[in-house]
């Protein structure tokens, strides 16, 4: 632990002015693991003037950083690049004349305290005023800056010509597109100071290329993947003062695929579990031993979870018998195509031949988490009746 500091497994605090520290505290290689440090408290360190780019990067778990009543004059732009957990920064009563929003733009700070610094009135610190105005909390800080006449003026009154928030405007066609097709988005940005423009495509899977020239830009997305349905694409304008974004949601239409279909499992009901992907929502149809399966309150499709264009559900069977053993085929269909998969189901042996049920499925009714109503397609057809499951419904449940 550096001289003038104390260290624990999760904290470093340096408050002794003598001899004091001249650089940001660093831990010895074989001491505490810097990743476990969550709080650094520095006070009364008049000779600490700079935070360099690599000073803080080892403290990846850092949540609270306090440097008060010290000599801090300069913070490198990328000083906090690796500190994504930072939530509270307190730089009260230092010697900061300027501070860029670039230091903090990637952080989700709940507190940034900058009181008592000799800021110079310029467009560089206008973002702090904007931040203060956006925070409608009553505990706004009393911040000042020095103007050309060396007069202290409240930041709340600061007016700088040609220094405002930018704007972004995304011109998008109807963003419903078929899988495999391509699309181009256009965006224009405006503002003074002139903003930079960039695209935020999140975790877009599809191949994309962007072209930007000053205040105009385009994004070309090619061979669009079904995995990108529901994703948001944003055009962002950013300058010294702040940023603005305009966003659109991508909808991708694609043929269904049955990504999962397995043999029955038993809980509160027997369930043949499946997962189907498709957009628009596929219609589902079950076949039993090659014939259309007529659903009833004893055999029916239930969707448990819908996640974007993915549907997780069950063909639910109440008290099936040997009469329900056989091949079950699921067909999923929409206007872009269809998919089918088949499984063999064995619920119990024929009476007198194979007495026991499958030992993996004990012969009891298990409590389950319930089922949601089926919201995919119409699966009822009255032809080719197949054996219903036990219509006496021994458990007396309502359906």
């Amino acid at each position: 632990c550096p001289t003038s500091c104390k260290c624990s497994a999760s904290r470093i605090w340096c408050s002794d002015p003598s001899p004091g520290i001249v650089a940001f505290p660093r831990l010895e290689p074989n001491s505490v693991d810097p990743e476990n440090i969550t709080e650094i408290f520095i006070a009364n360190q008049k000779r600490l003037e700079i935070i360099n780019e690599d000073d803080v990067e080892a403290y990846v778990g850092l949540r609270n950083l306090t440097i008060v009543d010290s000599g801090l004059k300069f913070v490198a732009h990328k000083a906090f690049l690796k500190n994504s957990n930072l939530q509270h920064i307190n730089f009260t009563r230092n010697k900061l004349t300027s501070l860029s929003r670039k230091h903090f733009r990637h952080l989700d700070l709940s507190e940034l305290i900058l009181v008592g610094n000799p800021f110079t009135c310029s467009c560089d610190i206008m973002w702090i005023k904007t931040l203060q105005e956006a925070k409608s909390s009553p505990d706004t800080q009393d911040l000042y800056c020095l103007n050309e006449s060396s007069k202290n003026i409240p930041l709340a009154n600061l007016q700088i010509p040609n220094c405002g928030l930018p704007s972004a405007n995304l011109a998008a066609p109807n963003l419903t597109v078929e899988e495999g097709k391509s699309i181009t988005l256009s965006c224009s940005v405006a503002g003074d100071p002139v903003p930079n423009m960039y695209w935020d495509v999140g975790n877009l899977v599809s191949k994309h290329m962007n072209e930007t020239s000053h205040t105009q830009g385009s994004l070309r997305i090619t061979n669009i993947s079904s995995d990108d349905s529901g994703k948001q694409i944003s055009c962002v304008a950013e300058n010294l003062v702040g940023e603005d974004q305009d966003s659109v949601n991508l909808t991708v239409h694609f043929a269904p695929t049955i990504t999962f279909l397995e043999s029955p499992t038993s809980d509160h009901h027997w369930c043949i579990p499946f997962t189907v992907k498709g957009n628009p929502k596929p219609a589902l149809q079950w076949f039993y031993n090659g014939a259309i399966l007529n659903e009833s309150k004893y055999i029916c499709t239930k969707i448990h979870v819908t996640n974007h264009t993915e549907y997780h559900g069950c063909l639910q069977l109440d008290n099936p018998t040997h009469m329900n053993n056989g091949d079950y085929t699921l067909i999923a269909k929409n206007e872009y195509g269809k998919d089918e998969k088949q499984i063999s189901a064995h619920f119990m042996g024929w009476p007198g031949i194979d007495d026991g049920a499958n030992p993996n499925y004990p012969d009891v009714i298990y409590e389950d988490y319930g089922t949601a109503a089926n919201d995919i397609g119409d699966t009822t057809n009255r032809s080719n009746e197949i054996p219903s499951t036990d219509v006496t419904d021994k458990t007396g449940r309502e359906h």
Partner: antibody, heavy 122, light 107 residues
Framework: EVKLVESGGGLVQPGGSLKLSCAAS????????MSWVRQAPGKGLEWIGE????????NYTPSLKDKFIISRDNAKNTLYLQMSKVRSEDTALYYC???????????????WGQGTLVTVSA | DIQMTQSPASQSASLGESVTITCLAS??????LAWYQQKPGKSPQLLIY???TLADGVPSRFRGSGSGTKFSFKISSLQAEDFVSYYC?????????FGGGTKLEIK
């Protein structure tokens, strides 16, 4: 009846190791995703990680993945949590919980064990 | 990681009243959210999954709503046994995360 019974908890020294077990019965264990969740005394729930039905995919909460290992033995219907390099903040009640039979890990937990207490103290 | 912010941390109410608990996700999670009840000294019990679907055997006075980033959980006509702790949990992506919990206390 679906039953999950954890065991193996107890007092362990800081820096030490411990292996927890969860014995499952009343359902086809080999079909389900399984998770471990812990709860420090008087605190909230924290998901530790999950394992898929055949044990080929294991997901952990990032801060714990270097010290905890989840495994399963489908022949014994048992889920395991190997804990190493434990610290006082690992003191908690450790639950195993049953996930889903779907092909993806839709992890809501319909069934929980009663928990086993791990106390880390010198 | 997706942060789940649950509020309030504690709430007092009287028998027969209604209460609402809110859960905010730090990013959109669709409807992949569950609610649990935990009684002192007991394991959590699933009440609601997929944001709105009541788990089997759960009384209809419990109700879940919401999608995207904002979710609500309402208990109507509070009974004595409802004055315990409640947690939300996202199962949109790993690591699955829980809200900090809400303790319901009797007025």
């Amino acid at each position: 009846e679906v039953k999950l019974v954890e065991s193996g908890g107890g007092l362990v020294q800081p820096g030490g190791s411990l292996k927890l077990s969860c014995a499952a019965s009343g359902f086809d264990f080999s079909r389900y995703w399984m998770s471990w969740v812990r709860q420090a005394p008087g605190k909230g729930l924290e998901w530790i990680g999950e394992i898929n039905p055949d044990g080929s995919t294991i997901n952990y909460t990032p801060s714990l993945k270097d010290k905890f290992i989840i495994s399963r033995d489908n022949a014994k219907n048992t889920l395991y949590l190997q804990m190493s390099k434990v610290r006082s903040e690992d003191t908690a009640l450790y639950y195993c919980a049953r996930g889903n039979y779907y092909g993806s890990s839709l992890a809501w937990f319909a069934y929980w064990g009663q928990g086993t207490l791990v106390t880390v103290s010198a | 990681d997706i942060q789940m912010t649950q509020s309030p941390a504690s709430q007092s109410a009287s028998l027969g009243e209604s209460v609402t608990i809110t859960c905010l996700a730090s990013q959109t999670i669709g409807t992949l959210l569950a609610w649990y009840q935990q009684k002192p000294g007991k394991s959590p019990q699933l009440l609601i999954y997929a944001a709105t679907t009541l788990a089997d055997g759960v009384p209809s006075r419990f109700r879940g709503s919401g999608s995207g980033t904002k979710f609500s959980f309402k208990i109507s006509s509070l009974q004595a046994e409802d004055f315990v702790s409640y947690y939300c949990q996202q199962f949109y992506s790993t690591p699955y995360t829980f809200g900090g919990g809400t303790k319901l206390e009797i007025k």
